[in-house]
Interface confidence: medium
C-alpha cells in the first residue's frame, strides 16, 4: 500500500513534470517565436487513455520527437537546452510510471499538434495531482 511519504514524493514529481511541461508550452506559445508555424505542423501521437501513472509510457515514447521539435524553437525561450530538458522529464517519467511492469501504450487514431499534446499531458498531471491531495 502506498505510504504518505511515497504519495508525497509522487505528488512532488508530478508537480515538477507539470511545471516542465508548462514551461515548454509557454516557450512555444511565445508570440515572438518565429518557428511556431513550422512546429505546429509536426504531429504527435496521443494516448487512447491516460488516467493512471502507467500511462506515462505514452509520454515517454513521444519524448524524442518532442526534443526534435524543441530544437526548432529559439533557445532563448527555454532556460535549458532541449536535450537537458527532455532528459529531466524522462527521469521523472521513468520514476513515476515505474519499471516493474511493462505497459504497451495504445494511441488514439487522431494526431495532435505540440500545443494539443502538451495540454493533454498537463491536464493528466493536474488530474493525478488532484487525486493525491
Amino acid at each position: 500500500a502506498p505510504t504518505s511519504s511515497s504519495t508525497k514524493k509522487t505528488q512532488l514529481q508530478l508537480e515538477h513534470l507539470l511545471l516542465d511541461l508548462q514551461m515548454i508550452l509557454n516557450g512555444i506559445n511565445n508570440y515572438k517565436n518565429p518557428k511556431l508555424t513550422r512546429m505546429l505542423t509536426f504531429k504527435f501521437y496521443m494516448p487512447k487513455k491516460a488516467t493512471e501513472l502507467k500511462h506515462l509510457q505514452c509520454l515517454e515514447e513521444e519524448l524524442k520527437p518532442l526534443e526534435e521539435v524543441l530544437n526548432l524553437a529559439q533557445s532563448k525561450n527555454f532556460h535549458l537546452r532541449p536535450r537537458d530538458l527532455i532528459s529531466n522529464i524522462n527521469v521523472i517519467v521513468l520514476e513515476l510510471k515505474g519499471s516493474e511492469t511493462t505497459f504497451m501504450c495504445e494511441y488514439a487514431d487522431e494526431t495532435a499538434t505540440i500545443v494539443e499534446f502538451l495540454n493533454r499531458w498537463i491536464t493528466f498531471c493536474q488530474s493525478i495531482i488532484s487525486t493525491l491531495t
Epitope: 518565429p34 508555424t37 513550422r38 512546429m39 505542423t41 509536426f42 504531429k43 524524442k64 520527437p65 526534435e68 521539435v69 530544437n71 526548432l72 487514431d109 487522431e110 494526431t111
Partner: antibody, heavy 124, light 107 residues
Framework: EVQLVQSGAEVKKPGESLKISCKGS????????IGWVRQMPGKGLEWMGI????????KYSPSFQGQVTISADKSISTAYLQWSSLKASDTAMYYC?????????????????WGQGTAVTVSS | DIQMTQSPSSLSASVGDRVTITCQAS??????LNWYQQKPGKAPKFLIY???NLETGVPSRFSGSGSGTDFFFTISNLQPEDIATYFC?????????FGPGTKVDIK
C-alpha cells in the same frame, strides 16, 4: 529505399473527372506530409497543397482550393489528387513529393523525395 | 501569398565557372528557403534546405546562403551534369511558393 510511385499518364476530355495516385514505400507513410506540385508545359513549379496521411489534415494553396481535392488512404500508403470536372488548362505534369523531417516524422521542410510525375492531358 | 523572384532567368557559363543565382522573397522568410534542381524531362531534386543546409548526397560544389528576403545559390565549379533549371521555394508560410526558375546551361 524510400520512393513515391505515381499512376500513369492520362488523356481526358474537358468536363471529365480524374483521380491520380501516389504510392509511398520504404518509410512510415502516415508520418510524413505529402505535397502536390503542378508544372504546366514549359513552365515553373506551382505548389498545390499538402496532406498528412496520418489524420488526413489537408492544406491547399488558395489558387487550387475548390479546383482539386487532395486525399489519402493510409491503409494502402497512397495519396490522391482529383478533379471533378477537368478543363483544358489542367493540362500539366503533376508531381507528388514528401516533406522531410526528423525522428521519422515530418513538418514543413523541403520536399526530399519526389514521384516520377503524372502527365495529364485534357483535350477535346 | 509570398512572392518569390529569381535572377537571372537564364545563364550560360563555362565548365569550371562559379555560378550564382539570386532568389528574393516579398517578405521576411527567416531562413526557410529550399533549392531544387530539375533536369529536362525529370522530377525536381532536393538540393538545399533552410537556406544553407546541403541535403545528404548532394555534391559540395553546391551551396546556399542568405536570410530574411535575399538568398543566394552557388555552383562553385560548374560541371556538364549541372545543366538544369534551379528553383527556390519558401516554406515559411502557406501556401509554399516557388521562384520562376533559373535555367543554367554550358557555353
Amino acid at each position: 529505399e524510400v520512393q513515391l510511385v505515381q499512376s500513369g499518364a492520362e488523356v481526358k476530355k474537358p468536363g471529365e473527372s480524374l483521380k491520380i495516385s501516389c504510392k509511398g514505400s520504404g518509410y512510415r507513410f502516415t508520418n510524413y506530409w505529402i505535397g502536390w506540385v503542378r508544372q504546366m508545359p514549359g513552365k515553373g513549379l506551382e505548389w498545390m497543397g499538402i496532406i498528412y496521411p496520418g489524420d488526413s489534415d489537408t492544406k491547399y494553396s488558395p489558387s487550387f482550393q475548390g479546383q482539386v481535392t487532395i486525399s489519402a488512404d493510409k491503409s494502402i500508403s497512397t495519396a490522391y489528387l482529383q478533379w471533378s470536372s477537368l478543363k483544358a488548362s489542367d493540362t500539366a505534369m503533376y508531381y507528388c513529393a514528401r516533406h522531410g523531417g526528423y525522428s521519422g516524422r515530418s513538418y514543413y521542410y523541403g520536399m526530399d523525395v519526389w514521384g516520377q510525375g503524372t502527365a495529364v492531358t485534357v483535350s477535346s | 501569398d509570398i512572392q518569390m523572384t529569381q535572377s537571372p532567368s537564364s545563364l550560360s557559363a563555362s565548365v569550371g565557372d562559379r555560378v550564382t543565382i539570386t532568389c528574393q522573397a516579398s517578405q521576411d522568410i527567416s531562413n526557410y528557403l529550399n533549392w531544387y534542381q530539375q533536369k529536362p524531362g525529370k522530377a525536381p531534386k532536393f538540393l538545399i534546405y533552410d537556406a544553407s543546409n546541403l541535403e545528404t548526397g548532394v555534391p559540395s560544389r553546391f551551396s546556399g546562403s542568405g536570410s530574411g528576403t535575399d538568398f543566394f545559390f552557388t555552383i562553385s565549379n560548374l560541371q556538364p551534369e549541372d545543366i538544369a533549371t534551379y528553383f527556390c521555394q519558401q516554406d515559411d508560410n502557406l501556401p509554399f511558393t516557388f521562384g520562376p526558375g533559373t535555367k543554367v546551361d554550358i557555353k
